[in-house]
């Protein structure tokens, strides 16, 4: 799976938040950022994730698509120069320091499962998605694809406004 | 190559409702959004809503949410759209449209039926 | 309901001309805009997409741009098969919406 610019195609500012209405919040304790999932009190402001969108060459063709066999693949940056990361070791997401160009456990294809909600699968560990556990994200394995409507990797996005790059 | 081969013209009278067809060929049909748009007699174009034949979810613009049923069938790679209490203001061209992206809806166009007319009349 | 206008409704131009049409947003939607090309009799099809980013196949003569509310489509090199209506859309957010069209006629 390639991707196919070096630039994002979209970018949008938003907020992420979980199947069933809670938020993902980023805190930084000891240097590093922790990735929560939590009920926000009423007028708690959500955090703010920029989602940028690449289009990525789907690695096989035997669909018969040809060129046209795109996908959508997402990385996810609540604060500058940190992106989620898919550790597939350890089946966790977390937040990493990282430099462009951003290393493939950066990358998530973006699967709309329902109308309104996302799902994200690792691209270096296909059929593994961002999911929820114990309150916090984690790598989550789909096994087929009648899973991928599980609630716990399906996500809401609220977005605030367009993110205009350069 | 992709294709998205529509069913044909119908002549239909007020208060009927109609199904019309779009069989998917060329692509992994569960793998992408299908949408549908209408395009009345020298008019501009309405999208009417999409769905996901892989899971059946779809999403609608409410204008047309009690107007149209989206459904698929997944064995035939067709997709269908049926239309209740037909009036002569559901008149129009419709296309079956899908996407140029595996797994997500931008709602963007990239490949279109042949359009299906529809004239509701007595 | 974010609305699409499209300006002007129609222009005369000749092969060879360089052409500029025009779609504004009623409100702010970024660079989620695509313009299709609708030929006499046929289905429309896709031609930019993002704002400026040229679909697979689709001729370098056309090229997209703006950002926000305000954005153009512009034809170098104006060939026959352009004769067409051209329509933008905002795409990404539900429900996409098309402007009303711009017809391009050839002299």
């Known amino acids: 799976m390639s991707i196919t610019g070096i630039s994002p195609i979209t970018e949008y500012l938003a907020s992420l938040s979980t199947y069933n209405d809670q938020s993902i919040t980023f805190a930084l304790e000891d240097e590093s950022y922790e990735i929560y999932v939590e009920d926000l009190k009423k007028d708690e402001k959500k955090d703010k994730v920029l989602l940028s969108y690449y289009e990525s060459q789907h690695p096989s063709n035997e669909s018969g698509d040809g060129v046209d066999g795109k996908m959508l693949m997402v990385t996810l940056s609540p604060t500058k120069d940190f992106w989620l990361h898919a550790n597939n070791k350890e089946h966790s997401v977390e937040l990493h320091k990282s430099e462009k160009p951003l290393p493939d456990q950066a990358f998530f294809v973006l699967h709309n499962m329902h109308s309104n909600s996302v799902s994200f699968e690792s691209k270096t560990d296909p059929g593994v998605f961002i999911g929820v556990k114990d309150n916090h994200l984690a790598l989550i394995k789909v096994d087929s694809s009648e899973n991928l409507s599980t609630e716990n990797i399906l996500f809401k996005l609220s977005e605030t406004h367009h993110h205009h790059h350069h | 190559q992709v294709n998205l081969l529509q069913s044909g013209a119908t002549l239909v009278k007020p208060g009927a409702s109609m199904k019309m067809s779009c069989k998917a060929s060329?692509?992994?049909?569960?793998?992408?959004?299908v949408s549908w748009v209408k395009q009345s007699h020298g008019k501009s174009l309405e999208w009417i809503g999409e769905?996901?034949?892989?899971?059946?979810?779809?999403n609608f613009n409410k204008e047309f949410k009690d107007k149209a049923t989206l459904t698929v069938d997944k064995s035939t790679s067709t997709a269908y759209m049926e239309l209740t209490r037909l009036t002569s203001e559901d008149s129009a061209v419709y296309y079956c449209?899908?996407?140029?992206?595996?797994?997500?809806?931008?709602?963007?166009?990239?490949?279109w039926g042949q359009g299906t007319l529809v004239t509701v009349s007595s | 309901i974010i609305v699409m206008t499209q300006s002007p409704k129609s222009m005369s131009i000749s092969v060879g001309d360089r052409v500029t049409m025009n779609c504004k947003a009623s409100q702010n939607v970024g660079n989620n805009i695509a313009w299709y090309r609708q030929k006499p009799g046929q289905s429309p099809e896709l031609l930019i997409y993002y704002a400026s980013n040229r679909y697979t196949g689709v001729p370098d003569r056309f090229t997209g741009g703006g950002y926000g509310t305000d954005f153009t489509l512009t034809i170098n090199s104006v060939q026959a098969e352009d004769a067409a209506f051209y329509y933008c859309q905002r795409i990404y957010n539900s429900p996409p919406t098309f402007g009303g069209g711009t017809k391009v006629e050839l002299k």
């Open positions: 769905i996901y034949p892989n899971s059946g979810a779809n």
């Open positions: 449209t899908r996407g140029p992206y595996y797994y997500s809806s931008q709602i963007i166009f990239a490949y």
């Open positions: 060329g692509y992994s049909f569960t793998d992408y959004w």
